[in-house]
């Protein structure tokens, strides 16, 4: 089970279904920015591979003071089986390139629907 | 109370390209998933796909080349285009709700019947 | 894609008679299944979702069961209205999958 209760969802859901809402709020994001995303704020690049949800959650953490991405880590935090706390990396980030926050979450969007269309939920 | 209302030409020459809209009352487009699925005479269902809120698309992989689902949310529609039809795409074709962190279909139109015939 | 495999395809039943149609999934979907009930040139209607809950307004003669791979609809006390049609439905991966039914005859 995908368990997002207490997060965003209701309760658990499945993982098409957590990925799904996953990706429409990051369409949300890319489609309402105005000015810079987070006051264009910069993040550690990741590798889109496997466990790039918590690397994605340690990466966005340490962005503070931005409500436009506050849901989109609190869905994260559903994906991650660990507990993850700003200052925190893995091996999946790319230590030496910083990109904007902006491009952070068009580069994971644009991941994240290739799995979905090619079903890869978990 | 959300309403769904499929309509359409009922017959479509093969090869052609079958045009469907399904009129939403009662509820906006611009709020959870909203579907296309189909059947068959005499048969089981089929998932096609679905448009969000967002204008998000997702199509089923085997119908894939053939389809585009869009919308229109000044008239609160959503529209399926199948192209280059052929009879094994004469159905009953229906659009359903989805609400936004669910998987299952809580509401259904009607139907349209499509037969694809020379 | 996930298979969904019904069973029986059709049955003959009396009024008052207790039916159980049962829904074979290909791959473990959790309680990711829900069913519906159809009526001859009528759209599906929503029965039971998450394999157990029923939807607002289903009377509680139907009920579900199961997860993982197996699943049961069950129609405690059969009733005039409930000759129809019934399909289950898997909710754990896309494409959504349905199977391919149940007809539910009058004896």
């Known amino acids: 089970l995908t368990c997002l209760g207490g997060f965003a969802s209701p309760g658990p859901v499945p993982p098409s279904t957590a990925l799904r809402e996953l990706i429409e709020e990051l369409v949300n994001i890319t489609q309402n920015q105005k000015a810079p995303l987070c006051n264009g704020s910069m993040v550690w690049s990741i590798n889109l591979t496997a466990g790039m949800y918590c690397a994605a959650l340690e990466s966005l953490i340490n962005v503070s003071g931005c409500s436009a991405i506050e849901k989109t880590q609190r869905m994260l935090s559903g994906f991650c089986p660990h507990k993850v706390s700003a200052g925190q990396f893995s091996s999946l980030h790319v230590r030496d390139t910083k990109i904007e926050v902006a491009q952070f979450v068009k580069d994971l969007l644009l991941h994240l629907k290739k799995l979905f269309r090619e079903g890869q939920f978990n | 109370e959300v309403q769904l209302q499929e309509s359409g030409p009922g017959l479509v020459k093969p090869s052609e390209t079958l045009s469907l809209t399904c009129t939403v009352s009662g509820g906006s487009i611009s709020s959870d998933y909203w579907n296309w699925i189909r059947q068959p005479p005499g048969k089981g269902l089929e998932y096609i796909g679905y448009?969000?809120?967002?204008?998000?698309?997702y199509y089923n992989p085997s119908l894939k080349s053939q389809i585009t689902i869009s919308r229109d949310t000044s008239k609160n529609q959503l529209s399926l285009k199948l192209s280059s039809v052929t009879a094994a795409d004469t159905a009953v074709y229906y659009c359903?709700?989805?609400?936004?962190?669910?998987?299952?279909?809580?509401?259904w139109g009607q139907g349209t019947t499509v037969t694809v015939s020379s | 894609d996930i298979q969904m495999t019904q069973s029986p395809s059709s049955l003959s039943a009396s009024v008052g008679d207790r039916v159980t149609i049962t829904c074979h999934a290909s791959?473990?979907?959790?309680?990711?299944l829900s069913w519906y009930q159809q009526k001859p040139g009528k759209a599906p209607k929503l029965l039971i979702y998450k394999a157990s809950d029923l939807h607002t307004g289903v009377p509680s003669r139907f009920s579900g069961s199961g997860s993982g791979t197996d699943f049961t609809l069950t129609i405690s006390s059969l009733q005039p209205e409930d000759f129809a049609t019934y399909y289950c439905q898997q909710g754990q991966s896309y494409p959504y999958t349905f199977g391919g039914g149940t007809k539910v005859e009058i004896k």
């Open positions: 359903a709700r989805l609400a936004k962190w669910t998987w299952y279909f809580d509401i």
């Open positions: 448009i969000s809120y967002n204008g998000n698309t």
């Open positions: 791959q473990n979907i959790n309680v990711w």
